[in-house]
């Protein structure tokens, strides 16, 4: 049978039928259903939701829907011994205490099991000492403090504002600086957009609102006790002392009302420049310690959270492919939330639910995709991407042989301005072509394509007339698929105007105020942006699963490889003398990129010309496309980060959320001027150039004619 016979309907009609079946009203209904109570990972409520989703996906028509459970390390506050921070006087009396919980939003006063704000996986402890304000606690902030200002954080409690980088990186930096505790807070400069009211009157963060979140530095390991292997019934677990990525000092998050009480008394050094000042009416003095009258007062943390091995549940749904059932296209997003999950994750989960329903409707009419589609509702994403990582560890052999693509589906919105896409270069053309076929939901772009509004509002910095598409970093469930397994991955959501809104993420991120009402009243009353995101995510899955030739363009990888090689070369050339002294050359890398470009070009020509009616040749060409991403995987991984194995992309060592290109070379060059042994340091740069050049060349050769 040809693929069209196997799927019963012509491909064009398939896609239209699928997209036409997606309804904004259903997404709205699903979002409401998913957000009425908290669904914290490891709780009974989240298990019940898993079973509900399993049941509904079966009703929608999937071939099978199973729960996959794992027993992983999670972290919870002590219910009878709350976490808080105090200002204490010289007698040890607590003269101020931070809040024990957030003021509940209207209509949710009687909801039980709202977990109070906490930093997941913080160790227990009651450190007391002087405070040091460390800005965003980025690598460069600690450089400024230690190298320029000569301020020693050793034995101090540091207070850092949320934003710019992943909170786990902040904690790691504070630990390395010798701090004995970390206080994280949301500054209005980052979480209060001018001219907008705070919740419940608008989408800004109120003073009592607090961002929860994990503070791990897992580097892709998954469950801290079972790195590399699934946390199943017969798992061997490490002792807590050997667990991966746990912080060693107490950490606690607070809102800006409480932060003001701590920061208003700060003395010591003035802030080094205006970039260290937020929007509170406080001096933003760095410290250490409080000013004159208050110099005898100290800060004391009271942290009593516990780490517990707890059962989590993924929901895995299968829609079997008619022609290539052994090729998997995966759509996955998490289900667990910190509290109600109005945006994160349920705005994404509601979209996945509607995509499943639409696919199910087509299947009930006799249609099947060419390739198998797997749908996943991941658990424990908020605790370190645990559900997705454990499932991928359990199924790694299948995935590395059969995985075509992974499309992530966390929050559908973080604003309502324009589309935001991060993906492998292999998917650039797919995304461009798809968005040209979709209608823009934006005001002022009626009758225009999504591609047009997106390109106008978020232009590519390199190519005129094209939209910006970003590198994949981490901080979400695509990590294991892309960074560890080398499966082509992408994500899409609606975002804010980054030009005018310079706050980090969205203001109510991971707070109790992330409710259904937040979305319905302020972000997307008509659910038109949710529908657009459903069309983009669903459309990508549809094309990946149903197109006869995989919709990957290897030439786009060639273009970015050249760009990344130029960039890393220019970073290295900031040290011309050392490059000469240690004979550092990038010739091998540029040569490999040139070869990749030529071979990719020839492959693309062959792709146009080959006989698509020959199933063996078709399968061969598709396999070359599928395995190209895999070819960028180094089985040895990156230095000290064995689960980050992609040579072209990795999460930044300084910010998990951001993607870094040629990360091995980048990290070897980072701060190289401060290394005690320059010869060894530049030797490592040379080794990393060698690894990168070899990998690019090896990947290129997978696209050569097979014989």
């Amino acid at each position: 049978k040809s693929s069209n016979e196997a799927t019963n309907i012509t491909p064009k009609h398939n896609m239209k039928a699928f997209l036409d079946e997606l309804k904004a009203e259903n997404i709205k209904k699903f979002l409401y259903n998913f957000t009425q109570i908290p669904h914290l990972a490891g709780t009974e409520q989240n298990f019940q939701l898993a079973k509900q989703i399993q049941s509904q996906w079966k009703e929608f028509g999937l071939d099978s829907v199973e729960l996959a459970h794992y027993d992983v390390l999670l972290s919870y506050p002590n219910k009878t011994h709350p976490n808080y921070i105090s200002i204490i006087n010289e007698d040890g009396n607590e003269i101020f205490n931070t809040s024990l919980f957030e003021p509940p939003p209207p209509g949710y006063e009687n909801v039980s099991d709202i977990v109070p704000p906490f930093s997941a996986f913080s160790p227990q402890g009651m450190p007391e000492g002087d405070l040091v304000y460390v800005n965003y606690a980025r690598t460069e902030d600690f450089f400024k403090l230690e190298r320029d200002m000569k301020i020693n954080c050793s034995g101090k409690i540091v207070i850092a504002r949320y934003g710019k980088v992943f909170r786990g990186n902040k904690v790691k930096n504070a630990q390395l600086a010798g701090a004995k505790g970390v206080i994280l807070y949301s500054d209005p400069a980052d979480y209060f957009a001018p001219g907008v009211k705070s919740y419940p009157d608008g989408w800004n963060l109120p003073g009592g609102g607090v961002q929860r979140g994990n503070i791990l530095n897992l580097n892709g390991a998954g469950d801290p006790l079972t790195p590399g292997y699934p946390a199943n019934e017969y798992a061997y677990r490490r002792g807590i002392a050997e667990a991966v990525g746990l912080p060693s000092i107490p950490v606690h998050p607070i809102g800006y009302y409480d932060a003001q009480k701590l920061l208003e008394k700060m003395g010591g050094s003035a802030p080094p420049d205006s970039s260290w000042r937020g929007s509170l009416k406080v001096p933003y003095n760095v410290g250490p310690g409080f000013t004159g009258n208050f110099s005898t007062q100290k800060v004391k943390m009271h942290i009593h959270s516990t780490n517990e091995v707890t059962r989590i549940y993924n929901v895995i749904g299968t829609l079997r492919g008619a022609v290539e059932p052994d090729r998997y296209v995966i759509l996955g997003g998490h289900r667990d939330s910190w509290v109600f999950g109005g945006i994160d994750p349920q705005s994404g989960a509601a979209v996945v639910h509607e995509i499943v329903r639409s696919f199910g409707t087509l299947k009930k009419e006799g249609w099947r995709p060419r390739r198998t589609i797997l749908f996943a509702s991941w658990d424990a994403e908020e605790f370190g991407l645990l559900g997705s990582t454990e499932w991928a560890e359990e199924n790694s052999r299948l995935l590395q042989e059969r995985g075509v693509a992974y499309i992530n589906a966390d929050s559908s919105i973080e604003g309502n301005y324009t589309l935001r896409v991060d993906c492998t270069p292999l998917m650039y053309s797919l995304v461009h072509n798809l968005t040209k076929e979709l209608k823009s939901p934006d005001e002022g772009f009626e009758g225009k394509s999504l591609y047009e509004s997106w390109t106008k509002k978020s232009p590519s910095p390199e190519f005129s007339g094209m939209p910006r598409i970003s590198k994949l970093g981490s901080g979400n469930d695509f990590e294991v698929f892309f960074q560890r397994l080398g499966i082509a991955s992408g994500r899409a959501r609606y975002t804010k105007n980054w030009e005018t809104n310079k706050f980090s993420g969205y203001p109510l991120y991971h707070s109790v105020y992330e409710t259904y009402e937040l979305v319905e009243k302020f972000y997307d009353p008509m659910f038109k942006y949710h529908l657009t995101v459903a069309q983009v995510r669903g459309g990508m899955v549809f094309e990946l699963a149903n197109s006869i030739v995989l919709p990957f363009d290897c030439r786009d990888y060639a273009v970015v490889l050249r760009k990344y090689a130029d960039k890393i070369y220019s970073i290295s050339m900031k040290h011309p003398q050392e490059m000469k002294t240690y004979s550092v050359s990038f010739d091998s890398l540029f040569s490999a990129v040139k070869n990749f470009t030529e071979i990719a070009s020839k492959f693309s020509e062959r792709l146009q010309d080959f006989d698509k009616s020959n199933p063996i040749v078709l399968r061969m060409m598709n396999d070359q496309l599928m395995f190209l991403e895999r070819a960028f995987i180094d089985p040895l991984g990156l230095p000290d980060r064995p689960f980050y194995r992609h040579v072209i992309y990795a999460p930044s060592s300084h910010n998990k959320y951001a993607g870094e290109s040629f990360p091995g070379i980048y990290d070897a060059l980072f701060d190289i001027e401060s290394k005690v042994d320059p010869s060894k340091a530049w030797g490592e740069v040379k080794r990393q150039i060698y690894v990168a050049a070899f990998t690019v060349q090896a990947a290129a050769e997978t696209l050569s004619e097979v014989a």
Epitope: P103, K197, S279
Partner: antibody, heavy 126, light 110 residues
Amino acid sequence: EVQLVESGGGVVQPGRSLRLSCAASGFTFTSYGMHWVRQAPGKGLEWVAVISYDGSNKYYADSVKGRFTISRDNSKNTLYLQMNSLRAEDTAVYYCAREHYDSSGYYHGYYGMDVWGQGTTVTVSS
Amino acid sequence: QAVLTQPPSASGTPGQRVTISCSGSSSNIGSNYVYWYQLLPGTAPKLLIYSNNQRPSGVPDRFSGSKSGTSASLAISGLRSEDEADYYCAARDDSLSGYVFGTGTKLTVL
């Protein structure tokens, strides 16, 4: 309708105790700081005490420190003022008041009071 | 306990504009928002002005507040007979970790 209703006032001898209650309705009590304010006969308003929305912080006027205790029961939407070692100068109308919250700004001005009860009279006399 | 200083009385004829002053220090008015309350005879205090110069809904725009340094003032334009009441300013006092009221001003509409 947002409402605060005080109760528990009365005549009491010096040195004795009294507990005032303030029942709140029509708003999310758990989300607001609450104050007690008093007005002695023929005098002006005097702030007495404040408690944060979660009960984690309590502050008192010097004139009542060590004698009065402010508390709240969020499950009952009720604010309390336990008054011990009462003195003649504690004679006043006692008001409970809700801390004002302004959603258009982010400065924590320890906002004033936007909703007041009708007051309950406490008379300390031998 | 520190208090904010107000004139004991003020007066005006209907339609006139009157101003009530409130003087404090750097630890109260100087570093915190000022609030104004109206006490009509036999009723509970009513919030008139918050955050120095903001009016709650339902308060006529005849009432306006301002703050400069360690002083604040309440202006009432188009004076009406129902404005006859006691007026109190108030602010948080950082040195007390508490709240202070003004001495109060009795406004008479002549």
